[in-house]
Interface confidence: low
């Protein structure tokens, strides 16, 4: 599997992973104790033809071109968890691994 | 996990799984021996706000709203394989399980 990495200076218009730091304090998410911010990344860019298509299915749907199918879009194809310390609804402090918080790779699906 | 199922008569505009039969013969994909057609399904519809968002990450990126982030899109969130009989590049007949050929569930990511 392969995915492009870009930054704000990149001239890449195709589907790419961009850096993004999520700041929980800035969102007012005060129930999160740690981390206060983390590198989440995000996906952006164009999915033309078969570029970075994760599944053969994506290509087949493009061929069949059913009514209403919007074509592939640039979306996370590999994600990873982070460990977080947070208050749950009962004001108990929980330490846990929260899945799918970081985008490791982007592709067209 | 939860995903909507629709058909051409559905009154649903949001992200939904629609039926689609892929016909390899119609594509001229004559290297595929069997199946000649199969039910692939596809995803279509709108991803408004937090509807059917698979990951908390999707919501966080929407909150952070970085430049170029296109918002969540309706894409397969669960896929399954099919068994296929086909010619490889060396004209050998191969029987194998091809991953991610059928959409089982759609969501916003």
């Amino acid at each position: 599997d392969f995915g492009l990495d870009c930054d704000e200076h990149s001239t890449e218009s195709r589907c790419c992973r961009y850096p993004l730091t999520v700041d929980f304090e800035a969102f007012g998410w005060d129930w999160i104790i740690a981390p206060k911010r983390y590198k989440a990344n995000y996906c952006s860019g164009e999915c033309e033809f078969v570029f970075l298509q994760k599944y053969p299915h994506t290509h087949l749907v493009h061929q069949a071109n059913p009514r209403g199918s919007a074509g592939p879009c640039c979306t996370p194809t590999k994600m990873s968890p982070i460990n977080m310390l947070y208050f749950n609804g009962k004001e108990q402090i929980i330490y846990g691994k929260i899945p799918a918080m970081v985008v490791d790779r982007c592709g067209c699906s | 996990d939860f995903g909507l199922d629709c058909d051409e008569h559905s009154t649903e505009s949001r992200c939904c799984r629609y039926p689609l039969t892929v016909d390899f013969e119609a594509f001229g994909w004559d290297w595929i021996i069997a199946p000649k057609r199969y039910k692939a399904n596809y995803c279509s519809g709108e991803c408004e706000f937090v509807f059917l968002q698979k990951y908390p990450h999707t919501h966080l990126v929407h909150q952070a709203n970085p430049r170029g982030s296109a918002g969540p899109c309706c894409t397969p969130t669960k896929m399954s394989p099919i068994n296929m009989l086909y010619f490889n590049g060396k004209e050998q007949i191969i029987y194998g399980k091809i991953p991610a050929m059928v959409v089982d569930r759609c969501g916003c990511s």
Epitope: G68, C73 | T11, E46
Partner: antibody, heavy 124, light 107 residues
Framework: QVQLVQSGAEVKKPGASVKVSCKAS????????MHWVRQAPGQGLEWMGN????????NYNQRFKARVTMTTDTSTSTAYMELRSLRSDDTAVYYC?????????????????WGQGTLVTVSS | DIQMTQSPSSLSASVGDRVTITCKAS??????LSWFQQKPGKAPKSLIY???RLVDGVPSKFSGSGSGTDFTLTISSLQPEDFATYYC?????????FGAGTKLEIK
């Protein structure tokens, strides 16, 4: 009530650009696709493209793809259509139109509200 | 692109007449067809969607029919305010395409 109010008439020289605005009111701007349609004097209607204000995703008519950019400003509920490298045959009334989903499948919608139109004249 | 052929291009009729305008698609568009009315200097107004469904507030003298490639708009009893140009639109696939229009004039 639901309303789309477009910017005023423009006169441009060939090769210039024009940016037409369409301010929405009376509904949730981000929840509906906005389309742009143009009409040359005495001619029929021609679809240019659309944009979904919620996420900025757009579809353009291939005929205009190299020259058009559609954008939205959700803070002011305004959609914009910019057309570059103007030619005399771009002289037309440009309309924005809201796509209303009545909901019986992916292509089930119609244009329920139109802007009043913006006349763009391209002349040297 | 899907071509929409509209006929006739112009039509003269009298108040009280019943008129029919046709639209033919170059390929099957299911029932994904709308009809519009446009008066000089005004924006188009939606009349019919999904080939035969009347838009809220549009009088029932307007009716639509057809599916696949052949569609019709019928106005059952013409009134002075109905003299205008009428367009069909396919919304089955991008790019959306309009018919060339039918100008309905008073005889």
């Amino acid at each position: 009530q639901v309303q789309l109010v477009q910017s005023g008439a423009e006169v441009k020289k060939p090769g210039a650009s024009v940016k037409v605005s369409c301010k929405a009111s009376g509904y949730s701007f981000t929840g509906y696709f906005m389309h742009w349609v143009r009409q040359a004097p005495g001619q029929g209607l021609e679809w240019m493209g659309n944009i979904y204000p919620y996420n900025g995703v757009s579809n353009y008519n291939q005929r205009f793809k190299a020259r058009v950019t559609m954008t939205t400003d959700t803070s002011t509920s305004t959609a914009y259509m910019e057309l570059r490298s103007l030619r005399s045959d771009d002289t037309a009334v440009y309309y924005c139109a809201r796509r209303y989903y009545y909901g019986t499948g992916p292509a089930d919608w119609y244009f329920d509200v139109w802007g009043q139109g913006t006349l763009v004249t391209v002349s040297s | 692109d899907i071509q929409m052929t509209q006929s006739p291009s112009s039509l003269s009729a009298s108040v009280g007449d019943r008129v029919t305008i046709t639209c033919k698609a170059s390929q099957d568009i299911n029932s994904y067809l709308s009809w519009f009315q446009q008066k000089p200097g005004k924006a188009p107004k939606s009349l019919i969607y999904r080939a035969n469904r009347l838009v809220d507030g549009v009088p029932s003298k307007f009716s639509g029919s057809g599916s696949g490639t052949d569609f019709t708009l019928t106005i059952s009893s013409l009134q002075p305010e109905d003299f205008a140009t009428y367009y069909c639109l396919q919304c089955d696939e991008f790019p959306l395409t309009f018919g060339a229009g039918t100008k309905l004039e008073i005889k």
